[in-house]
């Protein structure tokens, strides 16, 4: 993979009730930070559901963050670990308008990577993921 | 292709580097079905605390 | 009991579009995917998309894409799809089902409404 | 696309008899699910991932397979199994089903 040209979002989805970020431009090192949610739909996606069998669900619920780890400081790092992962899309051409978070092809794939994330890890004590980066493989 | 790379936060002691990528692995499939995103080459690697939004140009597995 | 109750039959001329919803009970909405899927007269059943009302997020396939819009009401606990610029070959039966996100998606569409005949004829 | 063959496309069948329908795949799959349908009422699930059977189905229908290849059997076919049945795969975006296979009294 090359090429230097990106686009990242350096906030945090997170599988609480989002909020407004309450950070200041002068954290900006730090990628962590809650985002009003994607869609219109206010939502709530610590809510698990577990199949048992074709006709019944159970639910559970991942406790949201608390306000306590929303901090900006290098205290976050008290209790939290960080992993960095990539990975590639085949199927998909990197183009300009994953330089440009405004686009609607930005916006449909960040959405989708972060609700896969917020389901695959959603049992494990996963608090969410954060500054998404595209570019060309 | 296009190349995603970003940070993923739990909390500390819930898993490790290698359970992340292999439950990430275990739904490449699910994703491709659900979002039409063929998944390949994944990496993961821990990341050391305190660490900028601009520390992610390389990485190691 | 979870149930999925669509609206009825719509008879539509080429050009116009019908909205069709689904409204669910018997389980908590949010949590589930809704999926659209058709069937025409003697043929065999086609995916048209799905929508998570956890967070409004759709996709499409992309035979329908710029006709089909996928849409919900989380307070009325209702999916709607809606098909434009309808044409003859639109005559089907269609079918809302939810099914479930990772990590159960495995389990499949296991509850389907009864389905709306969509009859497109000048 | 994946492309779903079914084979038998109908099959005539009298109570009791062993019955079984393959499902093809154009390219490998991880799994597929199972629907069957009556006329006029919508496709019920009626086995998920390959080989579980769906709550509410008799344990005398089984399905198994992988790759490309898999099948759904009943092993005494009772009044109530003549139905049209559908294979579906998800491994790849858009899912798709199969043509059916109508399942007729002899």
């Known amino acids: 993979a090359s090429g230097s040209a990106s686009g990242s979002a350096s906030t945090l989805v997170h599988n609480g009730t989002s909020a407004r970020a309450t950070t200041t431009p002068a954290s900006k090192s730090t990628p962590f930070s809650i985002p009003s949610h994607h869609s219109d739909t206010p939502t709530t996606l610590a809510s698990h559901s577990t199949k048992t069998d074709a006709s019944s669900t159970h639910h559970s619920s991942v406790p949201p963050l608390t306000s306590s780890n929303h901090s900006t400081s290098p205290q976050l790092s008290t209790g939290v670990s960080f992993f960095f992962l990539s990975f590639h899309i085949s199927n998909l051409q990197f183009n300009s308008s994953l330089e440009d978070p405004s686009t609607d092809y930005y916006q449909e794939l960040q959405r989708d990577i972060s609700e896969m994330f917020l389901q695959i890890y959603k049992q494990g004590g996963f608090l969410g993921l954060s500054n998404i980066k595209f570019r060309p493989g | 292709s296009v190349v995603v790379q970003l940070t993923l936060a739990f909390r500390e002691g819930t898993i490790n580097v290698h359970d992340v990528e292999t439950q990430f692995n275990q739904y490449k499939t699910e994703a491709a079905s659900r979002y039409n995103l063929t998944i390949s080459d994944v990496s993961v690697s821990d990341v050391p605390f305190p660490f900028s939004a601009q520390s992610h140009h390389h990485h190691h597995h | 009991e979870v149930q999925l109750v669509q609206s009825g039959a719509e008879v539509k001329k080429p050009g116009a579009s019908v909205k069709v919803s689904c409204k669910a009970s018997g389980y908590t909405f949010t949590d589930n995917y809704i999926n659209w899927v058709r069937q025409a007269p003697g043929q065999r059943l086609e995916y048209m998309g799905w929508i998570y009302p956890g967070s409004g997020n759709n996709k499409f396939n992309e035979k329908f894409k710029g006709r089909v819009t996928i849409t919900v009401d989380t307070s009325a606990s209702t999916a709607y799809m809606e098909l434009s610029s309808l044409r003859s070959e639109d005559t089907a039966v269609y079918y809302c089902a939810r099914d479930y996100p990772f990590p159960s998606y495995h389990y499949g569409m296991d509850y389907w409404g009864q389905g709306t005949t969509v009859t497109v004829s000048s | 696309d994946i492309q779903l063959t079914q084979s038998p496309s109908s099959l005539s069948a009298s109570v009791g008899d062993r019955v079984t329908i393959t499902c093809s795949a154009s390219s490998s799959v991880s799994y597929i699910h199972w629907f069957q349908q009556k006329p006029g009422t919508s496709p019920k699930l009626w086995i998920y991932?390959?080989?579980n059977l769906a709550s509410g189905v008799p344990p005398r229908f089984s399905g198994s397979g992988s790759g490309t290849s898999f099948t759904l059997t009943v092993s005494s076919l009772q009044p109530e199994d003549f139905a049209t049945y559908y294979c579906q795969q998800r491994s790849s975006y858009p899912p798709t089903f199969g043509g059916g296979t109508k399942v007729e009294i002899k």
């Open positions: 991932s390959t080989s």
